[in-house]
């Protein structure tokens, strides 16, 4: 480090700075000798308002220093970022969010949950930071599958649903009436058939949802970015397949009207047996014939597979057959079904170990007579679908 | 030699989103220093949009916070200045420069027009 | 937010004279103040930075002094190609800002 050159000044000895070491201490320092400024952890060297990552200082011919010292200012994660259906509190302080600060996220209760625990720690790389090391935001994810309806098994035509029944029901107009079930709270699950031909046009679907009356004027409005049509389904060749994902543009704001209706646990299969009873709830076809003006419902319970199957060979429905990718519900003597208009609609159960619905069916097909004997309501089997769902929406 | 060079559209319709690259040669962005963009109106008012620092820090104007985002690519050595609903008001010349301005890009300049 | 000011926008010299360009920050900025040349068409080129260190490969007729809120660039012995904007920044605390530049003339 020393280069003597008499002919050159000594520079000041240098101090360091507040939370910081110089090094290499020397008892002078003449032209070309340096040294560089070290912070304690949790401080960054700054000039100013400016980070550096390191600093070294050179002696010049005049005795000078060629850069004045900087300081060790301790680490400031800045403001942390607001979270989205959540909020944030200050655990060391207000406001407070400097080295080793605390701060809570949480949700917004009842609607929204988070996996982890929330508490993000300002670290000396000044990212505020998870107990897991992540330094990305939590997720407020909506709560799915809450209803105020209780299933009593009431096995007669529809009855009119209540607010808060089913908040995931969706709303689909377009050239016709169908329906669909949030999700998430920027997807929904429906039919195939229901949005056919809408890939392209997706400008002419309308979405509606945190609604009783179909024609309502107060309702939220969402509008498809994406239509996902299962790669099985063949549009005027049966159901099978019958499924999609509608993609919304912007998320939507879940409170007690609109609410993600779950996808089922693996478990699933044991709640859907035949004679569970299931509720599907739609604005089709009612006893009249006409669209439902509120949103009915009817509590139905499940069919014996090969039972239905044959009833659909007894009296077939054209082009259409009873697939493994399907189930079907309703009452050997009829009186109660889903009809045209209910369509994309879901067929839901409550999970009883959870306490929450979950979809296990959409609304596919079904007799023309809809509500005949032994005409059962055909619905997609959702169980068979879910890794098609998860792959569209953790690749979108 | 540290050499800076912003690159980007030039014309942006009104409401959209301005995306700009600075593709920094000669030092890398995660070595030291903090990483600037800058703009300049045309009556030559400067006005320090943000940076991002070596270690991916970032600092914004206040003024932009709403609309602005500074993020990097470190394997190709670049930093991006992003923002959104871009208006008339944002039609200037835009550098992006180190730390306290020892190296500036040579500037891009850019027109917000319908 | 600090403002800086430069109250002169024009200043007018003649080759070989000594011109001072001036610099006030509304609130005490320490010694964390750049100086910039900008001649037309071109970006901005640091001359000065820390209030009074001259950064690499600038002629020592610039110098800067000053701390706190006034601040000075000088130029002795003015040549022509000095012809150029001078802009003051302070960088002591987040917004950075700059001052609205002097336009030195040279007769």
């Known amino acids: 480090h020393h280069h003597h050159h008499h002919a050159s000044q000594p520079c000041p000895d240098p101090t360091a700075p507040p939370n910081g070491h110089i090094s290499p201490v020397q008892a002078t320092y003449v032209l070309k000798d340096s040294f560089s400024v070290f912070c304690k952890t949790g401080f960054e060297l700054l000039q100013g308002s400016v980070p550096l990552k390191s600093f070294t200082a050179v002696c010049q011919k005049d005795g000078s220093w060629d850069r004045p010292i900087p300081e060790c200012s301790i680490i400031d994660c800045g403001p942390p970022d607001d979270l989205p259906n959540g909020h944030v509190d200050y655990i060391t302080g207000p406001e407070v969010t400097t080295y080793k600060a605390v701060i809570q996220y949480s949700c917004e209760e009842t609607f929204y949950t988070m996996s982890s625990n929330g508490k993000y720690v300002c670290e000396a790389d000044g990212f505020w930071t998870s107990s897991k090391g992540e330094k990305s935001l939590p997720v407020c994810k909506p709560v799915c599958g809450l209803s105020t309806h209780t299933s009593g098994g009431r096995i007669i035509g529809g009855q009119p649903a209540k607010p808060g029944d089913f908040p995931w029901q969706v709303l689909l107009l377009g050239e016709t009436t169908a329906a669909g079930a949030l999700i998430h709270d920027d997807w929904v699950l429906t039919a195939a058939h229901a949005v056919y031909g809408k890939t392209e046009a997706m400008s002419s679907l309308d979405i509606r949802m945190g609604i009783l009356k179909r024609l309502s004027l107060i309702y939220t409005q969402a509008w498809p970015e994406a239509v996902f049509i299962h790669e099985g389904y063949t549009h005027g060749a049966g159901f099978d397949n019958d499924i999609a994902l509608i993609k919304l543009k912007n998320k939507v704001t879940i409170n007690r009207n609109i609410m993600p209706i779950c996808l089922p646990r693996k478990e699933a299969a044991s709640l859907m047996k035949t004679d569970f009873v299931g509720t599907v709830a739609g604005w089709g076809l009612t006893q009249k014939g006409f669209l439902a003006r509120n949103l009915m419902f009817v509590d139905i319970p499940i069919v014996d597979h090969q039972k239905c199957a044959t009833a659909y060979t007894k009296q077939p429905y054209p082009g259409a057959k009873v697939t493994v990718n399907m189930l079907c519900a309703g009452l050997d003597r009829g009186g109660k079904d889903s009809c045209r208009g209910d369509a994309g609609g879901a067929l839901v159960f409550l999970d009883n170990e959870t306490q929450r619905w979950f979809v296990g069916g959409i609304v596919s097909w079904g007799s023309i007579n809809c509500g005949g004997s032994e005409q059962y309501g055909v619905y997609t089997k959702v169980t068979n679908y879910i890794p098609w769902i998860e792959n569209i929406i953790n690749n979108f | 030699d540290v050499q800076l060079q912003e690159s980007g559209p030039g014309l942006v319709k009104p409401s959209q989103s301005l995306s700009l690259t600075c593709t920094v040669t000669g030092y890398s962005i995660t070595s030291d220093y903090a990483w600037n963009w800058i703009r300049q109106f045309s009556g030559d008012k400067l006005e320090w949009m943000g940076y991002?620092?070596?270690?991916?820090?970032?600092s914004y104007n206040p003024s932009l916070k709403s609309r602005i985002s500074i993020t990097r690519d470190t394997s190709k050595n670049q930093f991006f200045l992003h923002l959104s609903s871009v208006t008339t008001e944002d039609t200037a010349t835009y550098f992006c420069a180190r730390y306290w301005g020892d190296y500036w890009g040579h500037g891009t300049t850019l027109t917000v027009s319908s | 937010d600090s403002v800086m000011t430069q109250s002169q926008k024009f200043m007018s010299t003649s080759v070989g004279d000594r011109v001072s360009v001036t610099c006030k920050a509304s609130?005490?900025?320490?010694?964390?103040v750049a100086w910039f040349q900008q001649k037309p068409g071109q970006s901005p080129k640091g001359l000065i930075y820390s209030a009074s260190y001259r950064s690499s490969g600038v002629p020592d007729r610039f110098t800067g002094s000053g701390s706190g809120t006034d601040f000075t660039l000088t130029i002795s012995n003015v040549q022509s190609e000095d012809l150029a904007e001078y802009f003051c920044l302070q960088y002591n605390s987040n917004p950075l800002t700059f001052g609205g530049g002097t336009k030195l003339e040279v007769k």
């Open positions: 991002i620092s070596y270690s991916g820090s970032t």
């Open positions: 609130h005490n900025v320490g010694t964390n």
